[in-house]
Amino acid sequence: KLTIESTPFNVAEGKEVLLLVHNLPQHLFGYSWYKGERVDGNRQIIGYVIGTQQATPGPAYSGREIIYPNASLLIQNIIQNDTGFYTLHVIKSDLVNEEATGQFRVYPELPKPSISSNNSKPVEDKDAVAFTCEPETQDATYLWWVNNQSLPVSPRLQLSNGNRTLTLFNVTRNDTASYKCETQNPVSARRSDSVILNVLYGPDAPTISPLNTSYRSGENLNLSCHAASNPPAQYSWFVNGTFQQSTQELFIPNITVNNSGSYTCQAHNSDTGLNRTTVTTITVYAEPPKPFITSNNSNPVEDEDAVALTCEPEIQNTTYLWWVNNQSLPVSPRLQLSNDNRTLTLLSVTRNDVGPYECGIQNELSVDHSDPVILNVLYGPDDPTISPSYTYYRPGVNLSLSCHAASNPPAQYSWLIDGNIQQHTQELFISNITEKNSGLYTCQANNSASGHSRTTVKTITVSAELPKPSISSNNSKPVEDKDAVAFTCEPEAQNTTYLWWVNGQSLPVSPRLQLSNGNRTLTLFNVTRNDARAYVCGIQNSVSANRSDPVTLDVLYGPDTPIISPPDSSYLSGANLNLSCHSASNPSPQYSWRINGIPQQHTQVLFIAKITPNNNGTYACFVSNLATGRNNSIVKSITVSA
């Protein structure tokens, strides 16, 4: 069937439309286009004869139409009047006619809209605002956007006038937003520039900050006032009802008790004509004297002297407080407070008692702190430490030993080699050492204030060849699933690699095995009975390698759940009952038996000759491992038939 398709159906003014013919019959003589829904000679646009390929304009031809050999009609530079129906009249060779009608609609290209408002400065909770989208356009749809979102649902928002007008009733400050309108028709859509709604509001009740209402004499008073308001509020301050100044901040330096009173901030909005006030009561307290600490012993000796610290001045009806290391006083039998808490006594001072110490005097407002006091506790010297900890050195390297002993005042140091004094320094340096530098190295530390001396001796071996190492352990009898064991490969040697083997194999990968201390220490976490193996450590350097003798780990475990054998539970009267109990355990467990809950013998084997039905019952074997402190048991029922 002959049909007409309009492409497009909705046409913008000034554009073009193609009336496309479908299912055109065969063997045509010609065809004509007419404006309207029927064939009317007065409204013919154009005719076309196929044989001559001649197009003939009709009365309705505007010069903007082009007819194609396939009968399709193109209309250019479309005007509003072109809207409507178009009829194609087809004349077939057999002079039988056929008709088809199509249509399209013409719409204007919309201009960019704008928003007009009936109130540019509405007042919060009082005014309404009506926005209108201009211009008014036929066949256009109107849409509204707030902050680029579609309109929220609100009883205060109303659309009217075909959605062209948006009214906001009883505006609030939250309506301060970007508003846009949009016009749409089938051929175009345009959005306006945004209009910002400027809602006048406030002032709200002002806030005075800081919230603090108590001050000390001599401090500066700096109050700030803020009230939400549009336009911003104008501020005034009143003290005890008397006007002070028209500023947002009130500053009074070096206040006295006389500055106590009521402080009022007034906020005024000139556009809304509203005023709001807030009052705060300020109290100024007199400044007490700053406390300080006196001591009866400025250089106490550790473990010998006591020190009494006193908080000055003495003030009646005052609470005294103390702090050590910025913490309140710890509970300690060596710390004593006097009845009024004014004196703190440290009995038998230690080096850890240096402080700092602070005392405080409490008043109505706050606590006044003294300056911190540090005790100069004389102590030491402790046993000196010689570092590094290496005992083996390679020939040709430099030997640099450092000695340190905890001491106050700092210790004076001396070095001796094989008993011969070398130098009075903290560090001993010998370059390019040889085997002859092997020997006993002694560091002597001396405290001139206490007169005490302490020494440490270290054996240094100079050799490129490493000695046979040995393994030391921090736990010779670890308990299964409980203890950890740390093996350390001795000695500690410079420029040395440490290696480990278990049962002659290199270390297995296990989260329970950890190497540390430059691989010198092997730690087994949560030991199990399977860890009871031979452990060997090795040391190597550039010229030698050596292995220790094996150390076998003795893991204490068990007792596991015991097993009673034989498994039989039925016996004939007159038979011998011979039960044996076994439990995996290291060391071997202690065994005991109970029959029907009654203790029997402490043996691994329970023997009863010529049993009778009287021997029916429950037979329990109990095992205990004194080393692990663990116990276990099992119960077996025995039936004796007559």
Partner: antibody, heavy 120, light 106 residues
Framework: QVQLQQSGAELVKSGGSVKLSCTAS????????MHWVRQGPEQGLEWIGW????????EYAPKFQGKATFTTDTSSNTAYLQLSSLTSEDTAVYYC?????????????WGQGTTVTVSS | ENVLTQSPAIVSASPGEKVTITCSAS?????MHWFQQKPGTSPKLVIY???NLASGVPARFSGSGSGTSYSLTISRMEAEDAATYYC?????????FGAGTKLELK
């Protein structure tokens, strides 16, 4: 298994220099030290020194300071010995050797030796 | 440097005979090590750290000593033991070898 393959014999003019190579297989040279030892005709063994391929640290016998230079190329698992200012007294078989770190010995693996002949 | 003196320079032994080679150090050392070298081959470690038998070495070889005096002993000489034996110290740099002892089969 562990093997040390040394480069072939060298004939060098007096005053010249030569670079010998020692390629390891069966282990990573970074895990050990490489020592060099020489043996003159009908003579005993002389230790030249060692190199740690992991960091390039070296130790030379005083006699060979300035005469021998050790280098390594860990990507090819090869150690090198460069000898300079050669004289007839440097005519010898040069061995590379090392001890694997997992074993308890050192000097337990030796190359087959490279013969260096210095001619006037 | 630590000079190692080996004696004898040459020794001949019949199969089954006991052989002892000594090594004297000019300065005391912790351990002594022994190598065997046959003509045209690389040295081979036989004893390490004074008394430990290297891998694959027959039990007839043994080592002992301390300080400056060390020895290598073959309990029963066999034909395959004919070689030159060197001692070595690794205590101090430079590492040094003895001049060698040539062991011949009688």
């Amino acid at each position: 298994q562990v093997q040390l393959q040394q480069s072939g014999a060298e004939l060098v003019k007096s005053g010249g220099s030569v670079k010998l190579s020692c390629t390891a297989s069966g282990f990573n040279i970074k895990d050990s030290y490489m020592h060099w030892v020489r043996q003159g005709p009908e003579q005993g063994l002389e230790w030249i020194g060692w190199i740690d391929p992991e960091n390039g640290d070296t130790e030379y016998a005083p006699k060979f300071q300035g005469k021998a230079t050790f280098t390594t190329d860990t990507s090819s698992n090869t150690a090198y010995l460069q000898l300079s200012s050669l004289t007839s007294e440097d005519t010898a078989v040069y061995y590379c050797n090392e001890g694997t770190p997992d074993g308890p010995y050192y000097f337990d693996y030796w190359g087959q030796g490279t013969t260096v002949t210095v001619s006037s | 440097e630590n000079v190692l003196t080996q004696s004898p320079a040459i020794v001949s032994a019949s199969p089954g005979e006991k052989v002892t080679i000594t090594c004297s150090a000019s300065s005391s050392v912790s351990y002594m090590h022994w190598f065997q070298q046959k003509p045209g081959t690389s040295p081979k470690l036989v004893i390490y750290s004074t008394s430990n038998l290297a891998s694959g070495v027959p039990a007839r070889f043994s080592g002992s000593g301390s300080g400056t005096s060390y020895s290598l002993t073959i309990s029963r000489m066999e034909a395959e033991d004919a070689a030159t034996y060197y001692c070595q110290q690794r205590d101090s740099y430079p590492l040094t070898f003895g001049a060698g002892t040539k062991l011949e089969l009688k």
